[in-house]
């Protein structure tokens, strides 16, 4: 039961990251205009990974995408290629995880396959979560890296009467949805790696029995040994012995009511 | 067709205060910034302030903070501009005028209210 | 406060001229978002509300004739009338859209020679 509820909730934490990750990658503020050094102006800039907007005070509101591909700076497409690949996996990921999840029953999809399925979408959501805090990460310091350059620029070159205050940008609402949304599918994805550790058929009940017949001839089916690899496993083939040493979700192997919770 | 239509002229005593209004008609009230702006006799055009509307919120000049209150009422489609503790240097012509919707200047203006400021 | 200034104060010219009104803002108006001027031109006559004309610094209202004409960048902004008309003697402003307060330039009075 508990491995179930474990499975059950890195699926439901994974899918919120990645839903999040798409919301992240799709929003208009990854950076938005600082206004610490202009707090009264009328203009409000804020730009995404595919356009830029700049929202008058009149609450009329303008989008540029970015129409080209070649004049954009090379971590950019940097960040936006990760949030694509943290997409991708994520999204292969839970199409896995659904057909992993203990409570649905799939044909007579064995629980070692399960447990294969459910560890393969725990390293996509993974490897998805750790796609998004990168490309949120890389996007941050790039941020920081021009806050700075354009606070050095402002003071030098102002000997003159005219004042150009020129625009800073800082961190915007996408990237700390970004981190969160990251960590969530990270999280989500560790939980579905623990939770296939407990899905797979135990070693130890196969090695440790050993049979002596005695007298009459005891029915033994050949066969459990496969189990020991965690591939291709063959639940049809089971001994009549096993030692009672089942697990937990060894008991419930076969169609329950707990299954359709 | 649009229309802003203001109350008319006030003659006030120094200290007191003024309230004019300015009614709204041909168009969504509550979709655009009002502004305030005013010209005293022989000289040049004075941004007060602007209200929004729908949510009420205000942003005044620094010059007249404290003294100028901004209101609303979206049921009659009018927006109040109070100016208190007057001073002979307000008498002038008060405009409203609605923000313009596709950049930041306003694009239609009321006939104006001419407030006296005499003892 | 961004302060605008006008040039010249005052200007006397002749039905059919070319004239230009300049508009100088002690800070640049120009928005790197969208590389927009955020400066107004408007138009007085003696009793009347002012009228918009120009806004986003080159940009004219609709209605307003193409003998009208906005330019500049940054701090530098010019209000070209290509051919004086009767009805266009008036005073010019000039306002900063840019940061508030919205400063208006002192006025520019067109008058008849």
């Known amino acids: 039961m508990a491995v179930t509820a474990c499975q059950g909730l890195g699926f439901v934490v994974s899918l919120i990251g990645i839903a999040g990750i798409i919301a992240a990658t799709c929003m208009d503020q990854w950076s938005t205009q600082d206004l610490y050094n202009n707090p009264v102006t009328a203009v409000f800039n804020y730009q995404g990974l595919w356009r830029s907007c700049v929202r008058e005070s009149s609450g009329f509101t303008e989008c540029r995408g970015y129409f080209t591909l070649l004049g954009l700076p090379a971590m950019l497409q940097a960040v936006r290629a990760l949030m694509i690949v943290g997409i991708v996996l994520g999204a292969i990921g839970l199409l896995v995880s659904i057909f992993a999840l203990k409570c649905i029953r799939i044909g007579s999809m064995e629980d070692s396959a399960k447990a294969n399925m459910t560890l393969t979408s725990g390293i996509m959501f993974i490897v998805s979560g750790l796609c998004a805090i990168a490309g949120v990460s890389v996007f941050a310091n790039m941020l920081v890296t021009n806050f700075w350059m354009s606070t050095a620029n402002m003071y030098t070159g102002m000997g003159g009467m005219v004042q150009t205050v020129q625009t800073r940008y800082t961190f915007g609402a996408a990237l700390f949805v970004g981190w969160v949304a990251g960590g969530l599918t990270l999280i989500g994805g560790v939980m579905m790696c623990i939770a296939c550790r407990g899905l797979a058929p135990e070693e130890t009940n196969y090695k440790a029995v050993s049979y002596h017949a005695s007298g009459h001839s005891v029915a033994y089916k050949p066969g459990g040994f496969k189990a020991s690899t965690g591939f291709g496993s063959n639940t049809k083939n089971k001994k009549i012995y096993d030692g009672g040493a089942r697990t937990e979700d060894e008991v419930q192997s076969y169609p329950s009511k707990h299954d359709y919770v | 067709q649009v229309q802003l239509v203001q109350s008319g002229a006030e003659v006030k005593k120094p200290g007191a205060s003024v309230k004019v209004s300015c009614k709204a008609s041909?168009?969504?009230?509550?979709?655009?910034?009002m502004h305030w702006v005013r010209q005293a006799p022989g000289q040049g055009l004075e941004w007060m302030g602007m209200?929004?509307?729908?949510?009420?919120?205000?942003n005044y000049a620094q010059k007249f903070q404290g003294r100028v209150t901004m209101t609303r009422d979206t049921s009659t489609s009018t927006v109040y501009m109070e100016l208190s503790s007057l001073r002979s240097e307000d008498t002038a012509v008060y405009y409203c005028?609605?923000?313009?919707?596709?950049?930041?200047?306003?694009?239609?203006w009321g006939q104006g209210t001419t407030v006296t400021v005499s003892s | 406060d961004i302060q605008m200034t006008q040039s010249p104060s005052s200007l006397s010219a002749s039905v059919g001229d070319r004239v230009t009104i300049t508009c100088r803002s002690s800070?640049?108006?120009?928005?790197?978002?969208?590389?927009?001027?955020?400066l107004t031109w408007y138009q007085q006559k003696p009793g009347k509300a002012p009228k918009l004309l120009i806004y986003?610094?080159?940009t004219r209202e609709s209605g307003v004739p193409s003998r009208f004409s906005g330019s500049g960048s940054g701090t530098d902004f010019t209000l070209t009338i290509s051919s004086l008309q009767p009805e266009d003697f008036a005073t010019y402003y000039c306002?900063?859209?840019?940061?508030?307060?919205?400063?208006f330039g002192g006025g520019t009075k067109l008058e008849i020679k």
């Open positions: 005028a609605r923000r313009y919707y596709g950049s930041i200047s306003p694009d239609y």
């Open positions: 041909g168009y969504t009230f509550t979709s655009y910034w």
């Open positions: 209200i929004h509307p729908n949510s009420g919120s205000t």
């Open positions: 800070q640049s108006l120009l928005n790197s978002g969208n590389q927009k001027n955020y």
């Open positions: 986003w610094a080159s």
């Open positions: 306002q900063n859209d840019y940061s508030y307060p919205f400063t």
